[in-house]
């Protein structure tokens, strides 16, 4: 809190300009009018104020706008944004994508801070859904943004926004998130032809059900092992050896290196050993010949 002191003679600020740069904290408090600051916020970023000085400027804006800053001020906060707390930001009503971009630009190089998370939350809630332009902007600044959302939040993403998603944006998504995103991606890319469709859908396949994997196996897609290893175990288990062979194409040889890891390990345990032998990869652990396989889950369903 800055003490209230009278402004020295001749130091009253008539505009926000570089003459303020060496004002002490108390001089800024006493000599800069908050309303003037609010109307000339765009000038603040052109002046290398120290963080101590920025604290004073923030204090003045807080006094002027106790209910939260108007968007005209927010848009020009510049690196004063770094001084805002999540509590400050919760009072804002940010509707312009340009304002969001301006503030994300200031935060570039930082991890996603609680301030930024709050800002994005306020913005998205205000819009009602995560539209394509917003998603484009957010993933450009924070590739991991999508995977920071809960499955419930992801459900508000319209399929049209999926076009903005890049493979690296999904790197940290867990299966629950991909379960939500995959059907949206399938819908978004449904009019593409086989090979183009696979390129686009590939990074979402961690949410794909068995029947979609079976369908892909008929299309010569040559899925790489990294993608295969991210598939849902429950979706991979029902696939036959022939289907996995078709799905992976030349990459099928990679199964050997992954035979101890899920989902490959669990899939091997479900296959007949003589079927696995047809691959010629030396995969071991399948069901020995002559054994009968009872699908207990099917039995339970019938009873």
């Amino acid at each position: 809190e800055v003490e209230k002191t009278a402004c020295p003679s001749g130091k009253k600020a008539r505009e926000i300009d570089e003459s303020l740069i060496f004002y002490k904290k108390w001089e800024l408090e006493a000599c800069v009018d908050a309303a003037l600051l609010a109307t000339q916020m765009d000038r603040v970023n052109a002046i290398p104020f120290t963080y101590e000085q920025l604290d004073v400027l923030k204090h003045k804006l807080d006094e002027l706008y106790p209910q939260g800053y108007p968007e005209s001020v927010i848009q020009h906060l510049g690196y004063l944004f770094l001084k805002m707390s999540p509590e400050d930001i919760r009072k804002w009503n940010v509707t312009s994508l340009e304002t969001l971009k301006a503030l994300l630009e200031v935060n570039k190089g930082h991890e996603m801070s609680p301030q930024v998370a709050t800002l994005i939350d306020r913005f998205v809630k205000g819009r009602g859904q995560l539209d394509k332009d917003t998603l484009d902007t957010l993933t450009a600044f924070y590739p991991g943004y999508l995977c920071s959302l809960s499955p419930e939040e992801l459900s508000s993403v319209p399929p049209s926004s999926i076009w903005a998603v890049r493979p690296q944006d999904l790197d940290t998504c867990d299966p629950r998130q991909l379960d939500v995103l995959y059907p949206k991606a399938r819908l978004a890319f449904q009019n593409m032809n086989g090979s183009e469709y696979f390129v686009k859908i590939q990074s979402f396949l961690g949410g794909a059900p068995t029947e979609d994997l079976k369908a892909l196996s008929q299309q010569n897609v040559s899925m790489d092992l990294a993608t295969f290893m991210k598939l849902r175990t429950d979706a991979v288990l029902p696939l036959t050896v022939a289907e996995v062979q078709k799905l992976l194409g030349p990459h099928v040889e990679g199964l050997k290196a992954e035979e101890r890891h899920r989902p490959v390990r669990d899939w091997i345990l479900r296959q007949r050993q003589d079927d696995l032998d047809t691959l010629g990869l030396g995969l071991q652990g399948g069901i020995p010949n002559g054994y009968l396989v009872l699908d207990l889950s099917m039995q339970e369903a019938l009873s």
Epitope: T50, Y51, Q53
Partner: antibody, heavy 118, light 106 residues
Framework: QVQLVESGGGLVKPGGSLRLSCAAS????????MSWIRQAPGKGLEWVSY????????YYADSVKGRFTISRDNAKNSLYLQMNSLRAEDTAVYYC???????????WGQGTLVTVSS | IQLTQSPSSLSASVGDRVTITCRAS??????LAWYQQKPGKAPKLLIY???SLESGVPSRFSGSGSGTDFTLTISSLQPEDFATYYC?????????FGGGTKVEIK
């Protein structure tokens, strides 16, 4: 890309004068605050002088106040440091540096050596 | 505001994790930058706002801290990292630098 090139350094006797120049390119010079920072041989960095983008606001370290004058010519993309009444303790490499929106030094020149010795 | 760096010099090997500290004489929020200077060269900005990596700086460099105590960490020292490192505060004028930490080859 951003380039800052200092010149004007050299050997001068105590009490003498020198004028350092810094030619800037690759950025909008007139938008940036500029600084002179010096480094005595084997020592750390000392912020010597600062000039605002228009040239109307200036700072000097106490150690050079009254002896050094910073100026700029935005039309020529140039920064200057006029050094008078030089002392042995002014011996240093002098760097010009641009200030980003934060008061820190984003881009530096390669430096010019000033030696004050009789 | 005075900045005190420690140690003033250290010896380390390629691959080592190196930590340099900078202590401010009073609280400076997160208004701290780190620079690297190689012999005969100008300093180069590495980190600002205590922890933000300047564009183009390798991710093995990281900064942390707030208030009075700050740290620069090099997670796995590379041959090109042998240099002198300086901290600088920009919480209040006049802007000041730490005395430097020289990182030498063991």
């Amino acid at each position: 890309q951003v380039q800052l090139v200092e010149s004007g350094g050299g050997l001068v006797k105590p009490g003498g004068s020198l004028r350092l120049s810094c030619a800037a390119s690759g950025f909008t010079f007139s938008d940036y605050y500029m600084s002179w920072i010096r480094q005595a041989p084997g020592k750390g960095l000392e912020w010597v002088s600062y000039i605002s983008s228009s040239g109307s606001t200036i700072y000097y370290a106490d150690s050079v106040k009254g002896r050094f004058t910073i100026s700029r010519d935005n039309a020529k993309n140039s920064l200057y440091l006029q050094m008078n009444s030089l002392r042995a303790e002014d011996t240093a490499v002098y760097y010009c540096a641009s200030t980003s929106p934060r008061p820190l030094f984003q881009h530096w020149g390669q430096g010019t050596l000033v030696t004050v010795s009789s | 505001i005075q900045l005190t760096q420690s140690p003033s010099s250290l010896s380390a090997s390629v691959g080592d994790r190196v930590t340099i500290t900078c202590r401010a004489s009073q609280g400076i929020s997160s208004a701290l930058a780190w620079y690297q200077q190689k012999p005969g060269k100008a300093p180069k900005l590495l980190i600002y706002d205590a922890s933000s990596l300047e564009s183009g700086v390798p991710s093995r460099f990281s900064g942390s801290g707030s208030g009075t105590d700050f740290t620069l960490t090099i997670s796995s020292l590379q041959p090109e990292d042998f240099a002198t490192y300086y901290c600088q505060q920009f919480n209040s004028y006049p802007l000041t630098f730490g005395g430097g930490t020289k990182v030498e080859i063991k």
